[in-house]
Amino acid sequence: ESGYAQNGDLEDAELDDYSFSCYSQLEVNGSQHSLTCAFEDPDVNITNLEFEICGALVEVKCLNFRKLQEIYFIETKKFLLIGKSNICVKVGEKSLTCKKIDLTTIVKPEAPFDLSVVYREGANDFVVTFNTSHLQKKYVKVLMHDVAYRQEKDENKWTHVNLSSTKLTLLQRKLQPAAMYEIKVRSIPDHYFKGFWSEWSPSYYFRTPEINNSSGEMDPI
């Protein structure tokens, strides 16, 4: 501790705001879980700062995070997932700030993938499907998905649809004809676990058919 105090690092550190946020990802790599933390102030000097988690662990009392540029990261099987862990920002042996967190309440799912849209001519609709790695997981299986779509020219005019399945039908008449659309999807825990929205899936782009003048229907692409 005194080693830090001699050059003023510790005194300076105590003046800074070390508030941080974390998210967990369960069974993110086989049976391994991960925990990612970062400072809310991007300008914090992280040179001598470390993160440590203690309590509600299996076979160990505490684990140290790895530093990956601006984020701190753990990948382990050792999370008990019962009760609260104490996550601390440390400089040497001194804790600067700590939070008691239940890792099952800060779950961020993995982003959905394989998003696609298929036009059904006879039904005059679009079937949106996507996949999620969580269907195969033991813990965070039940998710709420947020499908967002917009006409490509409408920069911020997103339409959102919440659903619990991985399939959605969009009626052709609800969309503009002969228009290019962008669609994407994200997920959030919906049962037993709490947490945050996943990252968005990669966007998928599709074009709606033109209107067939004689019938008033859209032409397929």
Epitope: C54, V60, K61, L80, I82, Y192
Partner: antibody, heavy 117, light 110 residues
Framework: QVNLRESGGGLVKPGGSLRLSCAAS????????MHWVRQAPGKGLEWLSL????????YYADSVKGRFTISRDNTKNLLYLQMNSLRAEDTAVYYC??????????WGQGTLVTVSS | NFMLTQPHSVSGSPGKTVTISCTRS????????VQWYQQRPGNSPTTVIY?????PSGVPDRFSGSIDSSSNSASLTISGLVTEDEADYYC?????????FGGGTKLTVL
């Protein structure tokens, strides 16, 4: 002020069933891991079971696994222990306990279960 | 599963110091935190030490906890004994899916 009150104990015949309840107040119930612990007359403490805040995670001691079921109703702030195939050796005072900053932050006063023919 | 072994009883005179040991049968005592509970006759247990050596608020600093890796054991030390300390004391530790109590130690204040 945290309060845990067990109920549902009593006399039951071997092979019978009983459901214990634990009414919780004075804290955020749906944020807390909850446990059942028992103490046979003149004996030590024995941990039985725990349930996560959400009801997803449940764990049991080997001595009761397959016979006892822990559950909770967060809308009513109630913890339950369903006990089936009861044996004479299950005779004990049954405590519910709340896990907070440390494993057993708070305990109830206990309810006595007597298994006898 | 591991076991936690405590002495059946200990005793001490008022003002003196007693130590209660808690030895883990298999696996490392360092693998998870040790907690200590006091149970006075006719009462529910209360925590006197958590996370090896931490005292809940309201517990006097006469109570202290420690870990000895070399003997794979934990200890509860009570100094300046008073008659109200007469009680049963239990150590407890958890592993991945179980919580294990020691058999308990009866402390008699002579």
């Amino acid at each position: 002020q945290v309060n845990l009150r067990e109920s549902g104990g009593g006399l039951v015949k071997p092979g019978g069933s009983l459901r214990l309840s634990c009414a919780a107040s004075g804290f955020t119930f749906d944020d807390s891991v909850m446990h059942w612990v028992r103490q046979a007359p003149g004996k030590g403490l024995e941990w039985l079971s725990l349930v996560g805040w959400d009801g997803f995670f449940t764990y049991y001691a080997d001595s009761v696994k397959g016979r006892f079921t822990i559950s909770r109703d967060n809308t009513k702030n109630l913890l339950y222990l369903q006990m089936n195939s009861l044996r004479a050796e299950d005779t004990a005072v049954y405590y519910c306990a709340r896990q907070g900053d440390y494993v057993f932050n708070n305990w109830g006063q206990g309810t006595l279960v007597t298994v006898s023919s | 599963n591991f076991m936690l072994t405590q002495p059946h009883s200990v005793s001490g005179s008022p003002g003196k110091t007693v130590t209660i040991s808690c030895t883990r049968s298999s696996g490392s005592i360092d693998s998870s935190y040790v907690q200590w509970y006091q149970q006075r006759p006719g009462n529910s247990p209360t925590t006197v030490i958590y996370e090896d050596d931490q005292r809940p608020s309201g517990v006097p600093d006469r109570f202290s906890g420690s870990i000895d890796s070399s003997s794979n054991s934990a200890s509860l030390t009570i100094s300046g004994l008073v008659t109200e300390d007469e009680a049963d004391y239990y150590c407890m530790q958890y592993d991945s899916s179980h919580l294990v109590f020691g058999g308990g130690t009866k402390l008699t204040v002579l």
